[in-house]
């Protein structure tokens, strides 16, 4: 498929654009804003004459140079100045500030906990399948298959540490070679970047906020994908990671050490352990080919057990497998030996919610997945609103300057490297790159952190998670020390190589440009963000895995033409941008292709049609949910009762504004329930602009 023109700045005059999103319409006076035609992002639309030659090419609002959506927004302070407040007002303001800070910490805590529960939910839903991916050893010797298995497993269990520990166990028990494990580690690195991309989806309410948040999250994805694109073939050809890590291990003598401190787990575990506790050894056992593990539940039932070691007669294949010649005998058919068998005696049950439910893993997983996503979404909305209310005026200026300003010349280049160190340090503290990058996503969305600054922080996070893995490897038992350390080092040097590829030279910071391009597309067509997520993290890896099952010839037969087509499109795209004159007239743009092949507009129409159809059919069922949501968000949504009517009729009806009764406005409902027609809700002194519906 040809590249989307949305990524091009093909317009000769950036001030002329279709249905202006910003710029010309900014002159509309306030009083007219209520009546002016608006697009679905709530911005007024100015109809502009369009040159026919650009009609099929420029399908996205190209903002004028003066108003770049990637510029960090000015967080205006509309409140009363400190000096203008009386004593009572000042005390109230202090208490408000403390209250907001406590609320922020509370929501942040819930946010991190919900990420933990989300990971558990994913493991319950797809953990066993993930384990089975690993148990297919023959496929994993193929590096491409290994890569996609790494992606799929990490996406399924939402934890790169789980997939890494499985790989370590498999290498330690010689089920997998280090060479075969390296592509899987690369895949796990990609898979772990899905979490913050999911978190970014929660910010789809406001187009510009979503643009920034999604780009900020996907910069991680692009870094990982691009690194793999270069480093996987390099590793397959030279085995440099394997050789380098071998050299490191031979040069330095590593002793068992302390594991990294679990600072965040100490805080979150008391809460998350009340919700669910998993026996992660089950996934590992499935991966190791234990057929019995397939029937075990991942849900931990017994938390306190006593292990009794008893001597048991067991059969062995031959006398060589006996514990010792003294403990070896035969019954004439089989050879027997004495083995110490550990029998578990259950003492006390775990204290989580699902301990006494005899629900299957899948059911518990789906329940937890739904609940954790709702909490994640809710927390994110609240964090964004709280931050939006706190980060105004001076505070915002200070924070933005601190985070986004470079060192003075000639040390400006050092700023990014300091950000990498900060990202690594913060990740090391919280022991999870997912938590760090997910927490950073809303900050990028609201404009506190720029994409340019988020990029090195994300790269640092990638390094931080590998240093954690190295420490964990050093704390592992003697029999797995070498393999776990080598894998952790492979992971570390892979990320270092990636940084060397895509960071030091500004020109090579391709992930930023690609993420911004994707951010632009997703801001206009928000469904594309979901499509991107499903396509790159599920469909593509599954397809490649399926083709790998069929064997190398099939994989090459299907893969090579696709790769050649992509390369052809990229070459053509570069020629169109750099030197279109050498191309025939027909190939200077993508108009020679059907519209659906070079624009998302037709696809958008189909999806809009499908969703409106879905709304019409399913709305009645959703009426109860709608009312509950309205009760939670505090506005009695008049549309809930009318949702079974035809949408055509509904569009004719006027929105009846209902005053919000003290809750935050709900992102998904805000268009329907605007506070006094202005779309603003003031709670704890916060003015939070209402957002449009998510999709």
């Amino acid at each position: 498929m040809a590249p989307w023109p949305e990524l091009e700045n093909a317009h000769p005059n950036p001030n002329k654009f279709i249905e202006g999103a910003s710029g010309p319409q900014s002159s509309i006076p306030d009083k007219d804003k209520g009546t002016s035609k608006t697009n679905d992002s709530g911005t007024p639309v100015a109809k502009i004459e369009l040159l026919p030659s650009y009609s099929a090419l420029v399908l996205i609002e190209e903002p004028p140079e003066g108003n770049d959506p990637w510029d960090l927004p000015e967080l205006q302070d509309n409140g009363i100045k400190w000096s203008e407040r009386d004593s009572k007002g000042k005390i109230l303001c202090i208490f408000q500030g403390i209250g907001k800070f406590i609320l922020l910490l509370g929501f942040l805590y819930l946010f991190v906990c919900s990420l933990d529960v989300l990971s558990s939910a994913f493991q319950l839903v797809g953990g066993k399948m993930a384990g089975q991916f690993f148990s297919n050893n023959s496929i994993m010797s193929n590096p491409v298959a290994g890569l996609v298995i790494g992606v799929l497993v990490t996406v399924m269990v939402q934890s790169s540490s789980t997939s890494s520990s499985i790989i370590v166990s498999m290498v330690a028990s010689s089920l997998l070679s280090v060479r075969a494990a390296i592509p899987i580690i690369m895949g796990a690195n990609i898979g772990t970047s899905i979490t913050n991309t999911i978190v970014a989806l929660m910010q789809a309410g406001d187009r510009n906020e979503f643009r920034r948040a999604f780009a900020g999250a996907t910069v991680h994805d692009f870094f990982n994908w691009l690194s793999v694109l270069v480093l996987l073939p390099l590793e397959a050809a030279t085995h440099y990671l394997e050789k380098l890590t071998n050299l490191v291990l031979e040069t330095f003598s590593f002793q068992n050490g302390e594991d990294a401190p679990d600072i965040l787990k100490v805080i979150t575990d008391p809460f998350t352990k009340l919700i669910i506790q998993l026996d992660k050894k089950v996934i590992q056992q499935i991966a190791m080919g234990d057929s019995e593990a397939q029937n075990k539940s991942l849900i931990k039932i017994w938390c306190k057990t006593i292990s009794n070691v008893i001597e048991e007669n067991v059969t062995v294949p031959s006398p060589d497998n006996c514990t010792s010649p003294s403990y070896c005998w035969t019954d004439g058919i089989q050879t027997w030996t004495i083995q110490n068998v550990t029998e578990k005696e259950n003492i006390a049950k775990c204290q989580h919610i699902f301990v006494n439910f005899s629900l299957p893993d899948l059911a518990v997983g789906i329940i937890l997945l739904t609940v954790s996503l709702l909490i994640l979404c809710g927390c994110l909305i609240m964090i964004v609103k709280l931050l939006g209310s706190v980060l105004r005026g001076q505070v915002a200026t200070v924070i933005k300057k601190t985070l986004n300003t470079d060192f003075p010349f000639p040390f400006a280049w050092l700023t990014g490297y300091l950000a990498i160190l900060v990202g690594a340090g913060m990740t090391f503290i919280v022991q999870s790159s997912s938590v760090f990058t997910s927490a950073m996503t809303p900050l990028i969305g609201i404009g506190v952190i720029s994409i340019e600054r988020a990029y090195p922080l994300t790269l640092g996070s990638n390094i931080g998670t590998t240093t954690t893995a190295i420490l964990a490897a050093l704390a592992s038992p003697g029999n797995t020390l070498r393999s776990s350390l080598q894998i952790a080092l492979c992971h570390f040097f892979f990320n270092i190589s990636g940084i060397l590829l895509w960071y030091p030279i500004p020109f090579t910071r391709l992930p930023i440009r690609l993420a911004k391009g994707l951010g632009n597309i997703s801001a206009k067509y928000r469904w594309f963000a979901v499509f991107y997520l499903i396509f790159f993290f599920l469909l593509t890896p599954l397809t490649v895995f399926g083709l790998s099952l069929a064997g190398w010839p099939v994989l090459v037969g299907v893969g090579v033409p696709i790769i050649l087509l992509i390369l052809l499109v990229l070459c053509l795209r570069m020629l169109q941008a750099r030197c279109p004159r050498i191309l025939p007239l027909k190939l200077r743009d993508w108009n020679f292709l059907p519209l659906w092949m070079h624009s998302l507009k037709p696809w958008d129409n189909i999806i809009s049609l499908a969703t409106s159809c879905f709304q019409r059919r399913c709305c009645c069922c959703c009426r109860v949910c709608c009312r509950v949501c309205c009760m939670v968000c505090g506005c009695k949504c008049c549309r809930c009762s009318k949702c079974c009517k035809n949408l055509e009729e509904e569009e004719k009806e006027q929105d009846v504004p209902v005053k919000a009764s003290g809750g935050f406005d709900n992102t998904a409902m805000s268009k329907e329930c605007q506070d006094e027609g202005k779309g603003q809700v003031e709670v704890l002194g916060m003015k939070a602009l209402s957002n449009t519906t998510v999709f």
Epitope: S326, W329, I333
Partner: antibody, heavy 120, light 107 residues
Framework: QVQLVQSGAEVVKPGASVKMSCKTS????????MHWVRQAPGQGLEWIGA????????SYNQKFKGRVTLTADKSTSTAYMELSSLRSEDTAVYYC?????????????WGQGTLVTVSS | DIQMTQSPSSLSASVGDRVTITCKAS??????VAWYQQKPGKVPKLLIY???TRHTGVPSRFSGSGSGTDFTLTISSLQPEDVATYYC?????????FGGGTKVEIK
């Protein structure tokens, strides 16, 4: 009580084969390994092999491998031993025996024996 | 194969005497040794297994000891009915092997 009743004495020519039976009663046939031991006149005991009637798994003394076949018929609770390519030194009393001491090769019940005489 | 060497090949003792028969294995067999008694014209009878465990119905005057490669069968007080040939057997490895036998007679 456990009983192992073996077939009668056989006189066979060198190079021929002999198939003897061991009919069991008083226990569950498929539970215990059935061993075959021989004793040449005035000599010691020599283990030939064993069969687990439950699965049909067999184990043979390398000395007899290729010449001996152990089988078991679960329907009649009878074990069989066939010895081929007989030589004069195969003249012996052949015993079937079982070990009810689970997991050991110590045999505690014996058949009365089948005398096989190899003579031209 | 593991060789089991029994000694003596025959012995003569008086009623009431303490009789000791030894058996030496060519390699470590742990404690996987059994002792059998075979009276003239009869089938062998299991006396002891696991080196020292007496089989059901075996008189207490019979005892076994040893481990590894050296094993002993002891008849604490020889009785006229104990006249027989005694065999040791290892069941540590396949094939199971027997000793050459010790013939016990009464003086």
């Amino acid at each position: 009580q456990v009983q192992l009743v073996q077939s009668g004495a056989e006189v066979v020519k060198p190079g021929a084969s002999v198939k003897m039976s061991c009919k069991t009663s008083g226990y569950t046939f498929i539970t215990y390994n059935m061993h075959w031991v021989r004793q040449a006149p005035g000599q010691g005991l020599e283990w030939i092999g064993a069969i687990y009637p439950g699965s049909g798994d067999t184990s043979y003394n390398q000395k007899f491998k290729g010449r001996v076949t152990l089988t078991a018929d679960k329907s009649t609770s009878t074990a069989y031993m066939e010895l081929s390519s007989l030589r004069s030194e195969d003249t012996a009393v052949y015993y079937c025996s079982i070990s009810t001491i689970i997991t050991t090769g110590a045999v505690d019940y014996w058949g009365q024996g089948t005398l096989v005489t190899v003579s031209s | 194969d593991i060789q089991m060497t029994q000694s003596p090949s025959s012995l003569s003792a008086s009623v009431g005497d303490r009789v000791t028969i030894t058996c030496k294995a060519s390699q470590d067999v742990g404690t996987a040794v059994a002792w059998y008694q075979q009276k003239p014209g009869k089938v062998p009878k299991l006396l002891i297994y696991w080196t020292s465990t007496r089989h059901t119905g075996v008189p207490s005057r019979f005892s076994g000891s040893g481990s590894g490669t050296d094993f002993t069968l002891t008849i604490s007080s020889l009785q006229p009915e104990d006249v027989a040939t005694y065999y040791c057997q290892q069941y540590s490895r396949i094939p199971l092997t027997f000793g050459g036998g010790t013939k016990v007679e009464i003086k």
